[in-house]
Amino acid sequence: SAHAHPRDSCPLGPGRCCHLETVQATLEDLGWSDWVLSPRQLQLSMCVGECPHLYRSANTHAQIKARLHGLQPDKVPAPCCVPSSYTPVVLMHRTDSGVSLQTYDDLVARGCHCA
Amino acid sequence: SAHAHPRDSCPLGPGRCCHLETVQATLEDLGWSDWVLSPRQLQLSMCVGECPHLYRSANTHAQIKARLHGLQPDKVPAPCCVPSSYTPVVLMHRTDSGVSLQTYDDLVARGCHCA
């Protein structure tokens, strides 16, 4: 039913299903080294892993997508693991007038689900 | 830069990149035939297709994910095509006391982006 609760135990084994993972990246990796001053190294939480049937379904659409993927796998893709929320990050920017604080509300994932 | 506009022309060829596609589904397909009376057939818009570098990036996180996927493809997955908005759908339900109308705000995708 559309009211089924999203499954929270991974049937594929530990670490295989949709989860948050930290990736270290430098400003050079991001192409930001010209205009971001600090930090030079970022801990970027990202959503990785598979989305087996009904695992952490984001909403009704994701549940239906999972079901139809089972019926028509060539036509309907499986849900995929994307951020459900973000943690704000504050970076120091170089500006014409000196240094500014800039907040990124959508840079680092805080939680993940299957959409 | 993080301020790059998300790309909107598909470099992979027509219909290959993230877009909205209509999938026909019956209530039987959805497992809803016991309790939804009408409509018996639904046009379910879903998000399908690939997310090449910076195509329809949902936000800064998606742009960064695309960039890091290019650098570390085994560690960072490519962004994937998910709904950016939904169209409400009204279904007629069978209830103990007769029939009710129920709105689903998150069943049918209205737009897609790469997240």
């Epitope: 600090s38 930090p39 030079r40 704000p88 120091m92 604080l101 | -």
Partner: antibody
Framework: QVQLVQSGAEVKKPGASVKVSCKAS????????IFWVRQAPGQGLEWMGW????????HYAQKLQGRVTMTTDTSTSTAYMELRSLRSDDTAVYYC???????????WGQGTLVTVSS | EIVMTQSPATLSVSPGERATLSCRAS??????LAWYQQKPGQAPRLLIY???TRATGIPARFSGSGSGTEFTLTISSLQSEDFAVYYC?????????FGGGTKVEIK
């Protein structure tokens, strides 16, 4: 683990200068900036300014502009804060703080007491 | 500059009770607010950042809420080690500013 070790207490006369050091370890020094914060006896916390260890870019509190200079020595992973023309109301504990990507910081030095007295 | 105002200046609470500390910003700081705890002779300790995210190793009895100009730090059940001074700090704009502090003392 991240550690910030500051220089010892100082007693200075009004009009003199003081230079407080902050030696960092447990991380790549040039990856992060350093804030300086001070606290007068029995008072609250006052932000003094910030320096990036990578490029030496600084941003100072307006009220200290012209009297404060923040520098870094990347060869020794040490940050310095020099305050000139000291007055009695500069008497405070001075803290160095490593910046983080989240704004708030868990990484503080132990503090250096600077007493300005004639 | 953004002025951070904390209230009350002193809060007398019995161990085991709930403590609610307030912090008001003179203009919006979004969610760019941290809370620190400071005990006599020690450096401040980060409790909360991003208005509501607990720092590593901070017990669950500490929680933060609010955004914009009104923020709250709640200590659900005060332990003896929680009696200290608490500061809020905004990092939305230069200059970074702190509140005047709230002293939580034993009733």
């Amino acid at each position: 683990q991240v550690q910030l070790v500051q220089s010892g207490a100082e007693v200075k006369k009004p009009g003199a200068s003081v230079k407080v050091s902050c030696k960092a370890s447990g991380y790549t020094f040039t990856d992060y900036g350093i804030f300086w914060v001070r606290q007068a006896p029995g008072q609250g916390l006052e932000w003094m300014g910030w320096i990036t260890a990578y490029s030496g870019d600084t941003h100072y509190a307006q009220k200290l502009q012209g009297r404060v200079t923040m520098t870094t020595d990347t060869s020794t992973s040490t940050a310095y804060m020099e305050l000139r023309s000291l007055r009695s109301d500069d008497t405070a504990v001075y803290y160095c703080v490593r910046d983080t990507q989240y704004g708030g910081s868990p990484y503080w030095g132990q503090g250096t007491l600077v007493t300005v007295s004639s | 500059e953004i002025v951070m105002t904390q209230s009350p200046a002193t809060l007398s609470v019995s161990p085991g009770e709930r403590a609610t500390l307030s912090c008001r910003a003179s203009q919006s700081v979004s969610s760019n607010l941290a809370w620190y705890q400071q005990k006599p002779g020690q450096a401040p300790r980060l409790l909360i950042y991003g208005a509501s995210t607990r720092a590593t190793g901070i017990p669950a009895r500490f929680s933060g809420s609010g955004s914009g100009t009104e923020f709250t730090l709640t200590i659900s059940s005060l332990q003896s080690e929680d009696f200290a001074v608490y500061y809020c700090q905004q990092y939305n704009n230069w200059p970074i500013t702190f509140g005047g502090g709230t002293k939580v003392e034993i009733k």
